[in-house]
C-alpha cells in the first residue's frame, strides 16, 4: 500500500453566516494522526505513536498550516450562493500519496452538506464534477471564487501538492511509521447458532501495519472463502487496526478448527474454546 497523508477540514455556516472555527483531522497511512483542538487553537497529535513521529519538535508548523487552510475554506464557504436557512457544511478532503515506485498522487475533494460536488487532481489540475444540477451549481460557485486570480490559483495548487508531499516525507523520515510493528491480540469466541451448530469468531485487534491474514482452518487446511465471513480491517482509534473472521461449524467438532493469523512475518494458530470457557485470549 502507498504511504498517504489525508487532510479533512470542515467549516459551518448557519443562516448564511460562516461560523468562526473549523474542524480538522489529519490521517497518516490511514490512521488518525492529528486533530485541531478548537479550545486551544492548536494541532494536537492523536496518541503516543503520533507524538513519536515528530519527537520533541513542536506542532507549530501543523497548527499554522491547519489554521490557514481553515481560513481559506471559510472564505470559500462564504462564496457559495446556496440555501441560506439552517446549518450547512463545507468539507475539503485533500490526499497525497507516495507509492512503492516513488510515484506520487494528489487530489482534493469538496463536499457540501456531505455531498461530493467537486474533485481535482492536484498534479494535472483536472477538475471533475458529478452530474447533478446542484453539484454543477456549487462547483461553478467555488471554481469561480478559486479562479479569481488565475496565476495565484495555479501556484496555489502546485504548492498544495508539493506541501502535502513534503509533509508526508517529513513524517516518514522519522522512521516511526515505517518500522513500527505492533503484533495483534487474537481472541476466539463461540456462540450458539442453529440447532447442532455454533458460530466461531476470531478477532485480531491492536495490530500495525494494516496487512494481516486471518482465516479459519479445518484439520490444518484453510476453509474456502465462501464458508467464512470477514470484517473490514478498520482503525481502532489508537494508531492500530482491528478485524475479525467468523464461520459456522458443527458442535462437537471444535477441536478440528483453528484460527490462523499471519502478520509481519509472524504467524500463530488459535483453538476454539470448549463450551465451558467462553473466551480464549492470547498475544503471540
Amino acid at each position: 500500500e502507498p504511504h498517504s497523508l489525508r487532510y479533512n477540514l470542515t467549516v459551518l455556516s448557519w443562516d448564511g453566516s460562516v461560523q468562526s472555527g473549523f474542524l480538522a483531522e489529519v490521517h497518516l497511512d490511514g490512521q488518525p494522526f492529528l486533530r485541531y483542538d478548537r479550545q486551544k487553537c492548536r494541532a494536537k497529535p492523536q496518541g503516543q505513536w503520533a507524538e513519536d513521529v515528530l519527537g520533541n519538535k513542536t506542532w507549530d508548523r501543523e497548527t499554522r498550516d491547519l489554521t490557514g487552510n481553515g481560513k481559506d475554506l471559510r472564505m470559500t464557504l462564504a462564496h457559495i450562493k446556496d440555501q441560506k436557512e439552517g446549518l450547512h457544511s463545507l468539507q475539503e478532503i485533500r490526499v497525497c500519496e507516495i507509492h512503492e515506485d516513488n510515484s506520487t498522487r494528489s487530489s482534493q475533494h469538496f463536499y457540501y452538506d456531505g455531498e461530493l460536488f467537486l474533485s481535482q487532481n492536484l498534479e494535472t489540475e483536472e477538475w471533475t464534477v458529478p452530474q447533478s444540477s446542484r453539484a454543477q451549481t456549487l462547483a461553478m460557485n467555488v471554481r469561480n471564487f478559486l479562479k479569481e486570480d488565475a496565476m495565484k490559483t495555479k501556484t496555489h495548487y502546485h504548492a498544495m501538492h508539493a506541501d502535502c508531499l513534503q509533509e508526508l516525507r517529513r513524517y516518514l523520515e522519522s522512521g516511526v511509521v515505517l518500522r513500527r510493528t505492533v503484533p495483534p491480540m487474537v481472541n476466539v469466541t463461540r456462540s450458539e447458532a442453529s440447532e447442532g451448530n455454533i458460530t466461531v469468531t476470531c478477532r485480531a485487534s491492536s495490530f500495525y501495519p494494516r496487512n494481516i491474514i486471518l482465516t479459519w482452518r479445518q484439520d490444518g487446511v484453510s476453509l474456502s472463502h465462501d464458508t467464512q465471513q470477514w470484517g473490514d480491517v478498520l482503525p481502532d482509534g489508537n494508531g492500530t487496526y482491528q478485524t475479525w473472521v467468523a464461520t459456522r461449524i458443527c458442535r462437537g467438532e471444535e477441536q478440528r478448527f483453528t484460527c490462523y493469523m499471519e502478520h509481519s512475518g509472524n504467524h500463530s494458530t488459535h483453538p476454539v474454546p470448549s463450551g465451558k470457557v467462553l473466551v480464549l485470549q492470547s498475544h503471540w
Epitope: W14, D15, Q83, E85, G86, L87, H88
Partner: nanobody, 120 residues
Framework: QVQLVETGGGLVQPGGSLRLSCAAS????????IGWFRQAPGKEREGVSC???????YYADSVKGRFTISRDNAKNTVYLQMNSLKPEDTAVYYC??????????????LGQGTQVTVSS
C-alpha cells in the same frame, strides 16, 4: 397546548442590554435545537442565533460578539443575552425549534414575539 413564549423585550438606548427568554410549555426543550430570529417592519425574517441540545451555538454575522445564546433545560427555557445594542437590532424577536433545518424560519409558527426597540 404546545407553544413557545418569548419575553424580555423593551425599549433600550444604543449600547444597552436586554435578556430575552423563550419558555416552552407542553413539551420539553431538551432534545431540540432552539433558535431566535427577528423581523423588522417591511423586512424578511433574519436568523439571529441557534443552540443545539448539546450546547453548540451559532450566530449571525451581525450579532457575533454582542449576543450570547444559552439554555437552562431544568427551567425549560432558552435565553438570548443582547449587549451593545444598536438601532438596527430593532425588531420583533421570535424563538423557534429545529433551527438547524433548512426551513426553520420559513415554517416557524409565529407566536406573539417580543418587541425590541433600540432608540435614544
Amino acid at each position: 397546548q404546545v407553544q413557545l413564549v418569548e419575553t424580555g423585550g423593551g425599549l433600550v438606548q444604543p449600547g444597552g442590554s436586554l435578556r430575552l427568554s423563550c419558555a416552552a410549555s407542553g413539551f420539553t426543550l431538551d432534545y431540540y435545537a432552539i433558535g431566535w430570529f427577528r423581523q423588522a417592519p417591511g423586512k424578511e425574517r433574519e436568523g439571529v442565533s441557534c443552540i443545539t441540545s448539546d450546547g453548540n451555538t451559532y450566530y449571525a454575522d451581525s450579532v457575533k460578539g454582542r449576543f450570547t445564546i444559552s439554555r437552562d433545560n431544568a427551567k425549560n427555557t432558552v435565553y438570548l443575552q443582547m449587549n451593545s445594542l444598536k438601532p438596527e437590532d430593532t425588531a420583533v424577536y421570535y424563538c423557534a425549534a429545529d433551527c438547524l433545518s433548512s426551513t426553520w424560519r420559513t415554517n416557524a409558527y409565529l407566536g406573539q414575539g417580543t418587541q425590541v426597540t433600540v432608540s435614544s
